[in-house]
């Protein structure tokens, strides 16, 4: 498929222009070479117009031009002075006409409307309102005020002064007489229809002094906005619909065979299953504006996107709209990372996460995405040094491995971490991924003790046993903060017994802390990785406490406590809008709120790695 | 080559404080923990306190509590003990010890050449 | 506190000889299967050198004829065969417990 996109169909009138837009992957080799805008024959082939390199076909001469933008992967190609001969098959193209990439787009220039004089016209979104304005003289001002519609050769009735509504305009429209000082009646029309479009005539009186005025009516059906994304990458659909609809239920509708329009999201909390775990609407400011994200686009989720306002949460005819025709550009630059991660209840995960690699000094961000409502993602770690408060000791956010990718690891896991998560930055807003991470059957690969207590002033000693299929992976000790885990130096003390039907390549490694003081008190994790890239962690809570009596502290799985309890912890939630200090783009539109629900998680924890598109078990 | 380098002997007045300093070199600074030593002329040697430069954690002998404070310097990785109201009995020999903090297998493996404090008027 | 008792509180043994060294605390300083007890010898004007750690493991540069032994209370050094240069004074020190304690020392001479 040609990763070149443009307008499928422009649309225009005689003696207009129109500026088409055309995107392509802004690779070194896209942005220099030749882009072109030829028109297709009946026999094939497509003739050159107009091409960056200089070239004016004399069709176009004086009257067209071609710009280039390298920076933003676009090129627009502008063209004035339209008549009816310009209708037609068009390509814009990147390369030799004939090599396939290229975009087709049909152009339509029809004849302007033969008005009548002294017609005004009003020019109308689909959805909208419109005003139309009918003076009169003295003479009529007690006499009948109506307003027709010419279809064909007749006037049909649209409304009258009397009462009478053409059962077409039912419940939205008016007619308004002013007050005695002025000369006028209005007619409002509401939800505007693409057929309400044509000429009118409001007239007042019905005899031969009776005062006419002509209308024409143009609904435009909005063209829709192109916004070309990469595969794997989000789009923001920003919708302002005007504060007339400020309290009308708003949604997200992406059409499919026909007229159809399939909700993809709305306020009165329908969601596509397609887009579960990976769309956001955001709550709307107080002039009706709302905004949807999308992230982890599919091929699929190419299309015509509308956005409106209706009562019913889904498209109707009068339903105010925008529009956008959304490409999924499969020359993504976004990498392939897994798009699911398993891990087993007391175990941990290990979630690489991609971000743009011109961004190395960006803030990242991994959020829970919650569904309830219409979506939202409170943040649960940045790599500022903020950790939410029931995550602390079970997550951690490491740049490593660097160089386009960070990773998050989560430890001690239980059923509630089932969810979708995304991975983002306060750069580029395009790089939001999400990882769904899904608790299966099994037990945790890593064996440590559970509640450690150490004694002032003594040596702790903490094991961790790693089963045999770990035997070629990096084995680690660190303890955790909320900037990382600082690794620690452990000792490898032979093979473990604490597997069965496993040989000598099982390992036991110890942590060992001489001198324990109050400051050591905390989260550690034993794990694996394979040079910066992290594999499955275990969590122990050391707590430090004076010396009693005397006595031997051996800390073995055998005599290790059950998991920590569960505590329930202050929600330590921040609106997200609170890390946008530094850069106002940063979720401008994904306002999380206050999160009180999430508990402590005091369980231990197991991490995957595997395939692009799936995590599981622990090859790498 | 590891070294613990500690300042100058000090003649000093009672009731006034001083900080020994222990300069290291040769070694990963925040893997060990600093022990400092007093041995008084002729006595026994006794454990004052030990300082993990990785957190700052510290563990005093309760007879050395309120009279000194042990402190580290990272990015110098030197060690550092005040004494504070001294008097004729804080008199000695003052030595710091390293001590590998990650092995149950470790001890106080190498000492610095001691600082000589004298308290008189 | 756990309290170290040295014994002899000096000794005087013949070159060749074998010099034992005795240390007891007033409880266990075992722990994780190790004792926490380490000698030291000290020469005059010089700090301290480690010699034996864990009980029995001899530290670095430390010539074979320093050996340790003992678990629990009771330590012992043994220096076989005894040579001019190890004339000083050894203390034993237990590492299991703060405060760190060390024994009253042994002054060990050439007879």
């Known amino acids: 498929k040609s990763p070149i996109f443009g307008p499928e169909e422009v649309n225009s009138v005689e003696g207009n222009s129109v500026s088409i837009t055309c995107y392509y992957p802004p690779t070194s080799v896209n942005r220099h070479t030749r882009k072109y805008w030829c028109r297709q024959g009946a026999r094939g082939g497509c003739i050159t117009l107009i091409s960056s390199e200089g070239y004016v076909s004399s069709k176009y001469a004086g009257r067209a031009n071609l710009t280039n933008f390298p920076e933003n992967g676009t090129f627009v190609v502008n063209i004035a002075q339209l008549s009816q001969d310009d209708s037609g098959r068009y390509k814009c193209g990147l390369g030799i006409n004939s090599r396939g990439l290229s975009f087709d787009v049909s152009l339509e220039v029809s004849q302007g409307p033969g008005l009548l004089n002294d017609t005004k016209v009003y020019t109308v979104d689909l959805g909208r309102t419109v005003t139309i304005n009918c003076p009169f003289k003295t003479e009529n001002a007690q006499k009948r005020k109506s307003l027709y519609k010419q279809i064909g050769l007749y006037p049909v009735l649209v409304i009258d002064s009397s009462g009478y509504v053409n059962p077409n305009y039912t419940g939205r429209i008016r007619l308004d007489i002013q007050g005695t000082g002025q000369l006028l009646f209005s007619v409002v029309i509401n939800q505007l229809r693409l057929s309400d479009a044509g000429q009118y005539l409001c007239q007042a009186g019905d005899d031969s002094n009776s005062n006419k005025k002509n209308a024409d009516l143009q609904v435009l059906k909005p063209e829709p906005e192109l916004v070309y994304e990469d595969l794997r990458g989000s789009v923001t659909f920003h919708c302002a619909l005007g504060p007339e609809v400020a309290n009308v239920a708003k949604f997200l509708c992406r059409q499919s065979s026909g007229e159809n329009c399939d909700v993809v999201v709305n306020t009165l909390g329908k969601r596509a299953p397609a887009f579960e775990g990976r769309i956001l609407l955001n709550p709307q400011d107080k002039d009706g504006s709302f905004s949807v994200v999308i992230t982890g686009l599919r091929k699929e989720d190419a299309g015509r996107y509308l956005c409106g306002a209706h009562s019913d949460g889904q498209l109707q005819e009068g339903s105010p709209i925008q529009a956008w025709q959304l490409f999924v550009n499969e020359e993504s630059t976004i990498p392939r990372s897994p798009t699911v991660v398993k891990g087993v209840a007391g175990g941990s995960v290990a979630v690489l996460c991609p971000y743009n690699r011109k961004e190395s000094k960006s803030i990242k961000y991994w959020c829970l995405w919650e569904g309830a409502q219409n979506g939202r993602c409170p943040l649960l770690v940045d790599s500022e040094g903020w950790v939410k408060a029931q995550y602390e000791g079970r997550l951690s956010l490491l740049e490593e491995p660097g160089n386009g990718t960070f990773t998050v690891i989560l430890n001690q896991l239980t059923s509630r971490d089932a969810g979708f998560y995304w991975c983002l930055t306060n750069g580029d807003t395009l790089w939001r991924t999400t990882v769904e991470i899904k608790i299966i059957e099994g037990e945790p690969n890593l064996k440590v003790p559970g509640n450690v207590t150490a004694v002032l002033g003594e040596t702790l000693k903490v094991p961790c046993h790693f089963p045999c299929k770990f035997s070629s992976y990096e084995k680690y000790w660190c303890k955790w903060n909320n900037t990382g885990c600082q690794a620690l130096p452990s000792q490898d003390e032979g093979p473990s017994k604490a597997f069965v039907n496993c040989d000598e390549n099982s390992r036991l490694v110890s942590l060992t802390l001489n001198l324990v003081t109050r400051a050591d008190e905390g989260w550690y994790w034993c794990g694996v990785k394979q040079g910066h890239f992290y594999g499955e962690t275990a969590a122990v809570y050391v707590a430090v406490e004076e010396r009693k009596a005397a006595g031997s502290r051996d800390v073995s799985l055998a005599k290790a406590d059950a998991a920590p309890d569960e505590k329930v912890l202050d929600s330590g939630f921040r609106e997200i809008e609170n890390k946008a200090i530094q850069d106002p783009r940063l979720f401008a539109e994904e306002k999380a709120v206050a999160d009180t629900r999430d508990q402590a998680d005091g369980s231990r924890a197991s991490v995957d790695s595997g395939s692009s598109e799936e995590q599981g078990g622990s090859s790498r | 080559e590891v070294q613990l380098q500690q300042s100058g002997p000090d003649l000093v007045k009672p009731g006034a404080s001083v900080k020994i300093s222990c300069k290291t070199s040769?070694?990963?600074?925040?893997?060990?923990?600093m022990h400092w030593v007093k041995q008084s002329h002729g006595k026994s040697l006794e454990w004052i306190g030990g300082?993990?430069?990785?957190?700052?954690?510290?563990s005093y002998n309760q007879k050395f509590k309120g009279k000194a404070t042990l402190t580290v310097d990272k990015s110098s990785t030197t060690a550092y003990m005040e004494l504070r109201g001294l008097t004729s009995e804080d008199s000695a020999v003052y030595s710091c010890?390293?001590?590998?903090?990650?092995?149950?297998?470790?001890?106080?493996?190498?000492w610095g050449q001691g600082t000589t404090l004298t308290v008189s008027s | 506190d756990i309290v170290l008792t040295q014994s002899p509180a000096s000794l005087a043994v013949s070159l060749g000889q074998r010099a034992t060294i005795s240390c007891r605390a007033s409880?266990?300083?075992?722990?994780?299967?190790?004792?926490?007890m380490n000698w030291f010898q000290q020469k005059p004007g010089q700090p301290p050198k480690l010699l034996i750690y864990?009980?029995?493991n001899q530290g670095s540069g430390v010539p074979g004829r320093f050996s340790g032994s003992g678990s629990g209370t009771d330590f012992s050094l043994n220096i076989h065969p005894m040579e001019e240069d190890d004339t000083a004074m050894y203390f034993c020190?237990?590492?299991?417990?703060?405060?760190?304690?060390f024994g009253g020392g042994t002054k060990l001479e050439i007879k």
């Open positions: 010890a390293r001590y590998y903090r990650y092995d149950v297998l470790s001890a106080m493996d190498y």
């Open positions: 040769g070694y990963t600074f925040i893997e060990y923990t």
């Open positions: 300082i993990n430069p990785n957190n700052g954690g510290t």
């Open positions: 409880e266990s300083v075992d722990n994780y299967a190790i004792s926490f």
């Open positions: 864990a009980a029995s």
């Open positions: 020190q237990q590492s299991k417990a703060v405060p760190y304690t």
